[in-house]
Amino acid sequence: KSSNEATNITPKHNMKAFLDELKAENIKKFLYNFTQIPHLAGTEQNFQLAKQIQSQWKEFGLDSVELAHYDVLLSYPNKTHPNYISIINEDGNEIFNTSLFEPPPPGYENVSDIVPPFSAFSPQGMPEGDLVYVNYARTEDFFKLERDMKINCSGKIVIARYGKVFRGNKVKNAQLAGAKGVILYSDPADYFAPGVKSYPDGWNLPGGGVQRGNILNLNGAGDPLTPGYPANEYAYRRGIAEAVGLPSIPVHPIGYYDAQKLLEKMGGSAPPDSSWRGSLKVPYNVGPGFTGNFSTQKVKMHIHSTNEVTRIYNVIGTLRGAVEPDRYVILGGHRDSWVFGGIDPQSGAAVVHEIVRSFGTLKKEGWRPRRTILFASWDAEEFGLLGSTEWAEENSRLLQERGVAYINADSSIEGNYTLRVDCTPLMYSLVHNLTKELKSPDEGFEGKSLYESWTKKSPSPEFSGMPRISKLGSGNDFEVFFQRLGIASGRARYTKNWETNKFSGYPLYHSVYETYELVEKFYDPMFKYHLTVAQVRGGMVFELANSIVLPFDCRDYAVVLRKYADKIYSISMKHPQEMKTYSVSFDSLFSAVKNFTEIASKFSERLQDFDKSNPIVLRMMNDQLMFLERAFIDPLGLPDRPFYRHVIYAPSSHNKYAGESFPGIYDALFDIESKVDPSKAWGEVKRQIYVAAFTVQAAAETLSEVA
C-alpha cells in the first residue's frame, strides 16, 4: 500500500492544509474560554472542563475521546485554618503576620474557589525559630553556608528566594541541611523586570503576588502512593509514611512585601558576595536570627494543609492512522491550573485545542494520518505530573512497543522574544526543516523564516548558523515518556530574551495574576506567537505521524554523544591523580561513541537508498529509528532514581527543570572530593562509565544491519 492511499492529496499539500487551518483568532477564543474560572486539579470545575474538552474534541472529528481517571494524592490548604507565617516576640505574641491571600486582580474580585498561595504537599506544623537566609537554596548555596561560612542550618527556619532551580530541590536541600521549616519568596531581582509596571498595568509581579507550586521530590514516580503502577480502582496504596517524595518539614510561599518584613530584621553574617543580594531594600544578612534590637524575636510558621486522595481526569483523544494504526504520535499538555492559568497551562491547552480542530477538519475532508495521533489533556500536572504519569503507567506496555514520539504542549509562551525548543537529538533535523518552512512572527523579520529569526536571536553555542536546542530536563508531562519509557520527545514555546531579562521564568508564574488579560494585553495581543507555537507543535506532530520515513536523524545523536563524553571526561580530569590511583578510564565510552558514530553513518546511508515501496523493509527501518531512543533506557534506572532510566539524559539531581547528560557518571563525580570513602566513590564512577559505555554500544548495535 502507498502511504498516502488514505488521501488524494500529496504529503506537502497535507501539511500546508493543516497549517493553513490554524487560526490565531481561534486560539484567542479558546484561551478566553479556558481561563474564566480556576481549574485546580481534583475540583469539580476541572472535571467540567475535562468533559467540555471531550465533547469539543468529538465535535472536531476525532475517532474517539475518552476520560481516563485515577485516584491520586493531592494537597490542599485547610479552608477554615489558613496557612501563614508570623514574627513573634519573646512573650509569644504575633507582632507581624503574612497575608492570607493575594489581592484579586481587577474583574476577578467575586470569583470563588481561588486557592490561596500554598506549597503543595507541605506537612502540617508550627515550627518556630531563628531565620537563616539561604539565597536560592541551591546545592552550592548550602555549600557556601556550611563549608565556607560555617553556618549551621540545623533547627533553623530557612528563607529562600524562588528562581534558578525547581522549588522541590530547594526544600530537599534545606531538609538535608537540618532545617525545620522553609519560607519561599519571590525577590524583585528575579520576578520584576526593570522598566515594566506591576500587574494590572504591566506584566511584573506586584508585592502581594505569590508563586504557588508543589515541593515534591518524586524523581518520576507519579502518584506518591502508587509508584510504578496506575492509581486505579484496585490499586494498593502505600501508607503516607512510605509515600514517595513528600517533604518532611513545613514549607510556605510569600510575596516580596511580606518577605521585606522578615528580611529587614536579619542579623548575623553579612551576605558572602553580591550574588546573594536581591533587589529589596534589606541587608540580605544571612543570620542566623534577627539583629540586635530584634534578637529575641522569632519566626513561626502555621501550616495546616492536608493531603487527600482525589480523583483526577485525563482526556485522551484518538485519530486513527490509516497505514500504521499501531504506531502512536502523542501530543499532550495539561489542563489543571493553580488559579486561572492564563499562561500555565491554558496558553498551551488553547493551542492543542486548535491543533485538534485543524486535524479534525482534514479528517472530515477524507484525510487520515499515516500513523495514529493521540491527543491528551492531562490533569494534576501541577501536583507532580500525576495525570500523564499514571496514564503512561497504565499503558506502558503499549507505549513501549508502539510509541513513536511525544510532543509536549504546556505554556505556549513565557515571553515574546524568540522560539525555545528542547528535544531529543533525533528531532533536531525535523525542527530545523520545519522552522525553515514557517514564517517568523517577529518584528523586523517580516518575510523571513522562523528559523532565521530564531537563529539570529538564540544562536547555538556550538554550531554557527544554527539555533540553540536544549536538552530535555523535567518539570513537565514529557517526563514519563522520555525519561522512563524512552520515547523520543520534544517541546517548543516562545520565550523571553535571556540575555536582557535575568528574572526566573515569567514574573506572574503560578500567581492569581496569570489571567487571560495578562496574555491579551501584554504578551501577545495578536496571538501571533501562539499561532507560531501551534504551527511548530502541530507541524512536528504532522510530520511525525505522516512522513513515510520517520523524520529522525540518528547522526545527530552521534554528535551530541561525543560532546557529552568530552564534557564528562573533562569533569573527571579535574581529579587526575585519583583517575590514576583508581585506574579510571573513559576509553570504553569513547570507543562506544566512535562505534555509534560509524554505525549511525552507515544506517543513514542505507536510509537514503532502501526501497521505500517495500512495506516490510520500510517498517523495519522505521522500527530501528523508533526504538533507538528506547535503546538508551536502562531497565534498572539510575542510582536511587529507578524511574529515571535514560542513560544519556536525566533531570539534574540539583534542579529538576534542567537536563544533565550522562547523569549516572555526573552524579558519581559530583562533589566526589567530599566522599569520605574515595575508593568506593571512584569505584562507582567506574561502574557508571561501564553502564554508559555498554548502553551506547548496545544502542549502536540496534542500528546495525539486522542480518
Epitope: K574, H575, P576, Q577, E578, K675, D677, P678
Partner: antibody
Framework: EVQLLESGGGLVQPGGSLRLSCAAS????????MGWVRQAPGKGLEWVST????????SYADSVKGRFTISRDNSKNTLYLQMNSLRAEDTAVYYC??????????WGQGTLVTVSS | DIQMTQSPSSLSASVGDRVTITCRAS??????LNWYQQKPGKAPKLLIY???TLQTGVPSRFSGSGSGTDFTLTISSLQPEDFATYYC?????????FGGGTKVEIK
Amino acid sequence: EVQLLESGGGLVQPGGSLRLSCAASGFTFGNYAMGWVRQAPGKGLEWVSTISGSGGSTSYADSVKGRFTISRDNSKNTLYLQMNSLRAEDTAVYYCARVIRQVATTWGQGTLVTVSS
Amino acid sequence: DIQMTQSPSSLSASVGDRVTITCRASQSITSYLNWYQQKPGKAPKLLIYDASTLQTGVPSRFSGSGSGTDFTLTISSLQPEDFATYYCQQSYITPVTFGGGTKVEIK
C-alpha cells in the same frame, strides 16, 4: 596509593618555633581539605587545625589559636604547620591528615615535637 | 564545644568475644560520628564514618550504630589484630572533638 609524610619535628625550647611539613602523594592535593591532629604521650587525640583545598579557609583549636598557622602550597603538594610560642603542653606526635567533611580519612605516620628546656 | 565521652576507658576480652564500645555526645550530632582504631606506635585508621558506614577494607565484623547523642561500636568476633585503642569523633560542628579512647586488651 594515598600517602602523607610528615617532617620537621624535633626538640625545641619553650617559646621557640618549629615548622612542620607534610608531603602528599596519590591524590589531587588541591581538591582536598587537610588538617593536623596531635597526640600527647600516652593521651588521646586532639584536633589542631584544618585548611580548605584552596587554602582560603582555616580553623584552629582554641588551644593553639594565635600561635599556630596552617598553610599549604598546592603546586608542591605540601601542607605546613608553623608553630610559634611553643609550650610544654604542645609536646605531642603531630599527624597530618586528609580531611573530608571533618573526617580524617588518611593519616601520616606522625612526627614528634618535644618542647622542653 | 561538644564533649565526647567514651566508655569504658578500657576493657579486657578474649579472641572470639563480642565487644561493644559506647560513645555519648553532649548534644545531638545526628549521625556525624566516626570511629578510629589506633595500634601502639602507629597512626589512627578510620574504621566507620557517619555512625554506621564501613570504610573500604575494614572487616565486616566491625559495625556502628546510633544517632543523636548515643553511639555504639561493635566488634562481633574479636580477632588478635583488633587489640588496639578505639576513638570516636564528632564531625557535626567545628571544633571537631574526639572521645578519650577505649583500650581493648587481651584477657
